[in-house]
């Protein structure tokens, strides 16, 4: 049950959550596994139970405190272990010395809203959620707009190489329904990755004025 190819990946949301995914080909779905966190300079130890998310994949969240509390810093090291029950004992399946700020994945941006919409333009703003004050302005964003008849995968990516929590979309078609998403990434960390995409924001451009050239 434990001899398949395995992978253990964790990310810190920069505040009070470490999310982990453990995958193991050939493992039994009812195998009982957990992630144990052992920090080098904190008084707490933390454990979460890995719960199935797919056929051979389990996930859990180590919740370290209140969502906006700064529980770890750039100098912290947290040893993370996957422990799986084998009969009466626990076996270490994976181990890593986790540097939180080398392994960042922020929460998806929230509070997307249309600030102003015209026939060919739309100004949209958003907020970042549970992001550490350590980043100051060292964040970047990617955005995408879903046009009628296309898929999200076909949408071109717009890159904002600075902490800019708004965008002005141009060259839009009048009286057309669009959807918009954005994601965020700190510049820090060798294994840092993009946040999930935000919830899509639906908006409609204004119709062209009758009798006017569009």
């Amino acid at each position: 049950a434990v001899n398949g190819t395995s992978q253990f990946t964790c990310f810190y949301n920069s505040r009070a959550n470490i999310s982990c995914v453990w995958s193991q080909d050939g493992a039994l779905q009812d195998t009982s596994c957990q992630v144990h966190a052992w920090p080098d300079r904190r008084r707490w130890n933390q454990t979460c139970e890995l719960l199935p998310v797919s056929q051979a994949s389990w996930a859990c969240n180590l919740i370290l405190g209140a969502p906006d509390s700064q529980k770890l810093t750039t100098v912290d090291i947290v040893t993370l272990r996957v422990l799986c029950r084998e009969g009466v004992r626990w076996r270490v399946m994976a181990i890593q010395d986790f540097k939180p700020f080398e392994n960042l994945r922020l929460m998806a941006p929230i509070s997307l809203q249309v600030v102003h919409v015209e026939t060919h333009r739309c100004n949209i703003s958003w907020e970042i959620s549970q992001a550490s004050h350590y980043f100051e302005r060292h964040l970047e964003f990617e955005a995408r707009t879903l046009s009628p008849g296309h898929t999200w995968e076909e949408a071109p990516l717009l890159t904002l190489k600075q902490k800019q929590e708004w965008i002005c979309l141009e060259t839009l078609t009048p009286d057309t329904q669009y959807e918009f998403q954005v994601r965020v990434k700190p510049l820090q960390g060798e294994f840092t990755t993009w946040s999930p995409w935000s919830q899509p924001l639906a908006f409609r451009t204004k119709p062209a004025a009758l009798g006017k050239d569009t």
Epitope: V2, N3, T5, S6, Q7, F8, T9, W38, D40, I77, T79, R81, R91, V92, M93, A94, I95, Q96, D97, F98, K99, E102, N103, E190, F191
Partner: nanobody, 126 residues
Framework: QLQLVESGGGLVQPGGSLELSCAAS????????MSWVRQAPGKGLEWVSS????????DYADSVKGRFTISRDNAKNTLYLQMNSLKPEDTAVYYC???????????????????RGQGTQVTVSS
Amino acid sequence: QLQLVESGGGLVQPGGSLELSCAASGFTFSNYAMSWVRQAPGKGLEWVSSITGFGRGTDYADSVKGRFTISRDNAKNTLYLQMNSLKPEDTAVYYCARYSSSTYYPPTPARGRDYRGQGTQVTVSS
């Protein structure tokens, strides 16, 4: 570019000791788990020991447990293997190897290594 350079090998009598070193460069050393593997004459690669990025987790093959100690100095970008009570069957070329991430998997310690050095010869003989 990424480099791993082993040193410290040599000829030693049974029961003797050696310390192997591995100087790493071209990557952020502390972000990666590391290991030692060896290859005896005419044999395949054998895993010896692994260590996490900051040395808080270590593992050993049964054949060396209690005799060998793996350690690292991240300030010097160096991995070590202290070998005591050496036996003729420890004779091999010893290689330092990097895992592809900060994680290693104790049940399958050979998996996930992406680079290794050129090796250093250890001969245990009277």
